[in-house]
Amino acid sequence: TLNSVLNSNAIKNLPPPLGGAAGHPGSAVSAAPGILYPGGNKYQTIDNYQPYPCAEDEECGTDEYCASPTRGGDAGVQICLACRKRRKRCMRHAMCCPGNYCKNGICVSSDQNHFRGEIEETITESFGNDHSTLDGYSRRTTLSSKMYHTKGQEGSVCLRSSDCASGLCCARHFWSKICKPVLKEGQVCTKHRRKGSHGLEIFQRCYCGEGLSCRIQKDHHQASNSSRLHTCQRH
């Protein structure tokens, strides 16, 4: 359960949340379920698009979302599916193609004029005054990053890495996701043996920066499997 996960010492005692795990090229963060994040339920559709295994939307391209390929299918088997166009059914914003968002179960246009009247449907925290706000809240960055002149700075709420400025990725922190720095050489990283094997992560790190990969630190080779420290190292 969520409660046991959030209260487990294994999760609480992870190293400081400075960024995430290594993933496939273009993946934002190490995969984790949608714990305490709005719209985290996985929607099931028959629109099988790209059979790339995933655990959450950030692992897929900007025109894709992560879900089970068959209605009523095994919730543990999820792949990247084509985003849903305007007027198609949806259950969360990430399901809709860029330039649209999910309102009352339907993907609708997120053009500026239309959106102002719908702001209550998708409010989130202000981004440190990065964006124009209404009643102290700002538009959710996930409604097509192209809408904004500035991308989320470190600490801004996000849904996917394309919402964040250069050098940052979108990674989970407690009940939310924020823009965190991509890892530099020597920084601790998270390496998962295989997709879906890592369980629930409350603090995610970003992936290692360009030219770096997440590998076992040399002086930790003799340590037990459970205590092996991974750091970002030159290829």
Epitope: P38, E121, T124, W175, I178
Partner: antibody, heavy 117, light 107 residues
Framework: EVQLQQSGPELVKPGASVRISCKTS????????MHWVKQSHGKSLEWIGV????????SYNQKFKGRATLTVDKSSSTAYMDLRSLTSEDSALYYC??????????WGQGTLVTVSA | DIQMTQTTSSLSASLGDRVTINCRAS??????LNWYQQKPDGTVKLLIY???RLHSGVPTRFSGSGSGTDFSLTISNLVQEDIATYFC?????????FGGGTKLEIK
């Protein structure tokens, strides 16, 4: 305007239970997580726990686990906190607070609970 | 749990003063530090999040700084409406914990 309206003050006997409500307006209830915070008289703030209204998932501070129960009623956009087996130590001001980021953005006005025989 | 310490429990200053309120964490919390203002009537507001990010609608006279274990909230030009108690909060590790508060009064 985002608003969190909490229920009124409560005077309860030791050993009894209390339910505090937090009615929200001005935003989509299921888009925000709801936190509960305790402030004992003249003291600091303590995080009790959090609930995700979209699916009912909860997480509690170990100190309050087993005595505090967080629930929501999506139809009325209201969050509830039940606190049982009350003692004088539970006399405090209780706040609800909604957020999406790792900070508490919007707070209720507080509900004063007094435990006295 | 991570302990948050605000060594100054009360502080007196004059209107127009530059006021700094300090907060120390018992371990490194990176930038995961928020500041809240509690007015005498009990109203609580978020001022600063992620160490230095100003929350929407908060006057620019408020600023946050520091990193690791030592942090500070600065009010550059104290006005009457700033009279309140200020709390720091770490959100680096569960459970989130708060400092004891610093009560700001007018001289």
């Amino acid at each position: 305007e985002v608003q969190l309206q909490q229920s009124g003050p409560e005077l309860v006997k030791p050993g009894a239970s209390v339910r505090i409500s937090c009615k929200t307006s001005g935003y989509t209830f299921t888009e925000y997580t709801m936190h509960w915070v305790k402030q004992s008289h003249g003291k600091s703030l303590e995080w009790i726990g959090v609930i995700d209204p979209s699916n009912g998932d909860t997480s509690y501070n170990q100190k309050f686990k087993g005595r505090a129960t967080l629930t929501v009623d999506k139809s009325s956009s209201t969050a509830y906190m039940d606190l049982r087996s009350l003692t004088s130590e539970d006399s405090a001001l209780y706040y609800c607070s909604s957020t999406t980021g790792p900070w508490f953005a919007c707070w209720g006005q507080g509900t004063l609970v007094t435990v006295s025989a | 749990d991570i302990q948050m310490t605000q060594t100054t429990s009360s502080l007196s200053a004059s209107l127009g003063d530059r006021v700094t309120i300090n907060c120390r964490a018992s371990q490194d919390i990176s930038n995961y530090l928020n500041w809240y203002q509690q007015k005498p009537d009990g109203t609580v507001k978020l001022l600063i999040y992620y160490k230095s990010r100003l929350h929407s609608g908060v006057p620019t006279r408020f600023s946050g700084s520091g990193s690791g274990t030592d942090f500070s909230l600065t009010i550059s030009n104290l006005v009457q409406e700033d009279i309140a108690t200020y709390f720091c909060q770490q959100v680096h590790t569960l459970p989130p914990t708060f400092g004891g508060g610093t009560k700001l009064e007018i001289k």
